[in-house]
Interface confidence: low
């Protein structure tokens, strides 16, 4: 049967009908509704929003909508003992204190439950000592400090600017350097775009604005107390001392007004070069400690936050498939926010809401997708991707057998310049084909396709006439699906111009100023970029759920595997003598990639030519496509990261947000020249090459003719 017959479809019930039903005005209305009060994970307000979304998804026409709850470790400031940082004089008197909260934006002064800025999961403590400025607190920044400048951070409080890498990596690096506390701040060089006013007059960060965020190093574990298993009523919970990924030193975030007061007194070594200097009128001295006149003054942190097991709620909606109800296409994004969530997450949640409404409209008219679509509103993403991870842990056996694809739907915008897509190579062709059919919302591209404006503004570094698609890293709810379970995944949003806007994230990220008005006044007044993102996300889900043959192209995986093999080989070749000494060869990996390429090519030919009307054959070919991503999973996981199991991709060990290719080999090679035992270190490189080789070859064989 054709897909039309199979899904009881009339000619009007096609992708075009679905896309035409999506309306910018609805997304705007939903965003406004979702952003009037804070929806912090674990609070009553966020539970009420979950129930509202459940009710509305039912009204929209989904077959079922359930709340699933888990009891996970969350972290909150102490309501009676505020967190702050002081400068103290030799008598121990506090001569300066940082702000206790962000000045609320106009119109929100009387909103209760605005959580003050804090670093979630910071332990309690009141360390005091000299300050050391550590730039972005990246691995390379600590190398510069410790190896080149001979500055010891042991026993010191470090101050690091936000940006470039995930904040949890900064804290981990500081801990390893022996710091007793970490102060994170937003430097105007990274969070204040030149020529733009501060909120509420523009989209820049004011001096009192502060970025909240968790500082965990979970490596995909989910709830810190129940790694690997759902945090349900019968779960065994670890003690807090054995919890996964918790920081061991106090951490607190501040804005640049307060940072100025701390940094202006810094003495000690000068900054090594201009890449260590931000935009404040301070010397950016590294320290340790304050300069001459102030040398007896110290910095003291006062952190009183508490971690507590708290109930969270996901909303899971189901639209049952007509032909393959046991094949799941998942669209998920989180609902919890730090404060109002004007961009993160509600610009994404509003888009999901409109996608559900459009699918529901088609369903009410008698249509069903070929495969089951699951819609998810995740809780506690901001506290470590907890809602999505616990649900996936609870349903892992179903997901690994039935999961076709996961499309993520956090913030729809981080700018309004062009499209940004990160996805598995299996989805490249789907994304290219879809964006060729969609209209560009960009000025100057009226009547042109989204593909065309995207390619012009964000060209591929490798292939002329094609747009850039990036690797999946982490820091969002696709992590468990892709990195742990091996379900093909993708994400799309509108982004900034990375050439001209060098700041990290958008300036008001995770601050109280991330409001509905920020979006409506400055980012997307017509909600046309939101609509485009809805069309991309929704269109991907539609195709994945409704195409007779899954819209995956395994040949694109072959291309990237060759690119990644070349890249890791070139990194290793920086050590030619050691490679010779320890007999390190990449020949086997290149051979496996060649085999994969040939088998993928033959599979694609068979896919093109087989009888699509034969349901057994169709299911067999689709299963080979569905399970290809799964074939890259190593059940043993990566070294010291058991929940990162994908051999081709993992979040970078130095920046959770970034994706790394052949991560096992990459990590084995990283800083190998400093290893105490080179024989053991190069032995580990060889072991990782063999694992990668086996995995690529095994994945190739899943595409071979079945008999």
């Amino acid at each position: 049967k054709s897909s039309s017959e199979a899904t009881n479809i009339t000619p009007k019930h096609n992708m075009k009908a679905f896309l035409d039903e999506l309306k910018a005005e609805n997304i705007k209305k939903f965003l406004h509704n979702f952003t009037q009060i804070p929806h912090l994970a674990g609070t009553e307000q966020n539970f009420q929003l979950a129930k509202q979304i459940q009710s509305q998804w039912k009204e929209f026409g989904l077959d079922s909508v359930e709340l699933t709850h888990y009891d996970v470790l969350l972290s909150y400031p102490n309501k009676t003992h505020p967190n702050y940082i002081s400068i103290i004089n030799e008598d121990g008197n506090e001569i300066f204190n940082t702000s206790l909260f962000e000045p609320p934006p106009a119109g929100y002064e009387n909103v209760s439950d605005i959580v003050p800025p804090f670093s979630a999961f910071s332990p309690q403590g009141m360390p005091e000592g000299d300050l050391v400025y550590v730039n972005y607190a990246r691995t390379e920044d600590f190398f510069k400090l410790e190896r080149d400048m001979k500055i010891n951070c042991s026993g010191k409080i470090v101050i690091a600017r936000y940006g470039k890498v995930f904040r949890g990596n900064k804290v981990k690096n500081a801990q390893l350097a022996g710091a007793t506390g970490v102060i994170l701040y937003s430097d105007p060089a990274d969070y204040f775009a030149p020529g733009v006013k501060s909120y509420p007059d523009g989209w820049n960060l004011p001096g009192g604005g502060v970025q909240r965020g968790n500082i965990l190093n979970l490596n995909g574990a989910g709830d810190p107390l129940t790694p690997g298993y759902p945090a349900n009523e019968y779960a065994y919970r670890r003690g807090i001392a054995e919890a996964v990924g918790l920081p061991s030193i106090p951490v607190h975030p501040i804005g640049y007004y307060d940072a100025q007061k701390l940094l202006e007194k810094m003495g000690g070594s000068a900054s090594p070069d201009s890449s260590w200097r931000g935009s404040l009128k301070v010397p950016y001295n590294v320290g340790p400690g304050f300069t001459g006149n102030f040398s007896t003054q110290k910095v003291k942190m006062h952190i009183h936050s508490t971690s507590e097991v708290t109930r969270i709620y996901n909303v899971i909606g189901t639209l049952r498939g007509a032909v393959e109800p046991d094949r799941y296409v998942i669209l998920g994004g989180h609902r919890d926010s730090w404060v109002f969530g004007g961009i993160d997450p509600q610009s994404g949640a509003a888009v999901v809401h409109e996608i559900v409404r459009s699918f529901g409209t088609l369903k009410k008219e008698g249509w069903r997708p070929r495969r089951t679509i699951l819609f998810a509103s995740w809780d506690a993403e901001e506290f470590g991707l907890l809602g999505s991870t616990e649900w996936a842990e609870e349903n892992s056996r179903l997901l690994q057998e039935r999961g076709v694809a996961y499309i993520n739907a956090d913030s729809s915008i981080e700018g309004n310049y062009t499209l940004r897509v990160d996805c598995t190579p299996l989805m490249y062709s789907l994304v290219y084909n879809l964006t060729k059919e969609l209209e560009s919302p960009d000025e100057g591209f009226e009547g042109k396709s989204l593909y065309e404006s995207w390619t012009k503004k964000s060209p591929s570094p490798e292939f002329s006439g094609m747009p850039r698609i990036s690797k999946l890293g982490s820091g969002n709810d696709f992590e468990v699906f892709f990195q742990r379970l091996g379900i093909a995944s993708g994400r799309a949003r509108y982004t900034k111009n990375w050439e001209t806007n060098k700041f990290s994230s958008y300036p008001l990220y995770h601050s109280v100023y991330e409001t509905y008005e920020l979006v409506e006044k400055f980012y997307d007044p017509m909600f046309k970029y939101h609509l485009t993102v809805a069309q991309v996300r929704g269109g991907m889900v539609f195709e994945l759920a409704n195409s007779v043959v899954l819209p995956f192209d395994c040949r694109d995986y072959a291309v990237v595997l060759r690119k990644y093999a070349d890249k890791i080989y070139n990194i290793s070749m920086k050590h030619p003598q050691e490679m010779k000494t320890y007999s390190v060869s990449f020949d086997s990996l290149f051979s496996a990639v060649k085999n994969f390429t040939e088998i993928a090519s033959k599979f694609s030919e068979r896919l093109r030519d087989f009888d699509k009307s034969n349901p057994i054959l169709l299911r067999m070919m689709n299963d080979q496509l569905m399970f290809l991503e799964r074939a890259f999973i190593d059940p043993l996981g990566l070294p010291d990261r058991p929940f990162y199991r994908h051999v081709i991709y993992a979040p970078s060990s130095h920046n959770k947000y970034a994706g790394e290719s052949f991560p096992g080999i990459y990590d084995a090679l990283f800083d190998i020249e400093s290893k105490v035992d080179p024989s053991q270190a190069w032995g580990e490189v060889k072991r990782q090459i063999s694992i990668a080789t086996f995995t690529v070859q095994a994945a190739a064989e899943t595409l071979s003719e079945v008999a």
Epitope: K79, T80, P82, Y84, L100, S112, V115
Partner: nanobody, 116 residues
Amino acid sequence: QVQLVESGGGVVQPGRSLRLSCAASGFTFNNYGMHWVRQAPGKGLEWVAIISYDGNTKYYTDSVKGRFTISRDNSKNTLYLQMNSLRVEDTAVYYCAKGLWPSDVWGQGTTVTVSS
């Protein structure tokens, strides 16, 4: 039960001073940070000042910095707001509020009118 009672408001000329008090009862006063908040006629609420549970940390909105001083006497369960160099735009109902986030208990307010 938990109660906050403000006093000390009145009519005063620009440039003069007033001292507001807030008597707290029904809870352990020295465990809680406290706020002063104001509402000008026809306007929304505006944070004025905040003080930590032990009085060591204070924070002021920009428009009152250098003119207003928040303080507390934990032995008397009382919060104060010393207002100097008053301006016409300081005219408002002033409320004290318990707790930092959220402010879960409010007083009934005391009116300050600054007029020549």
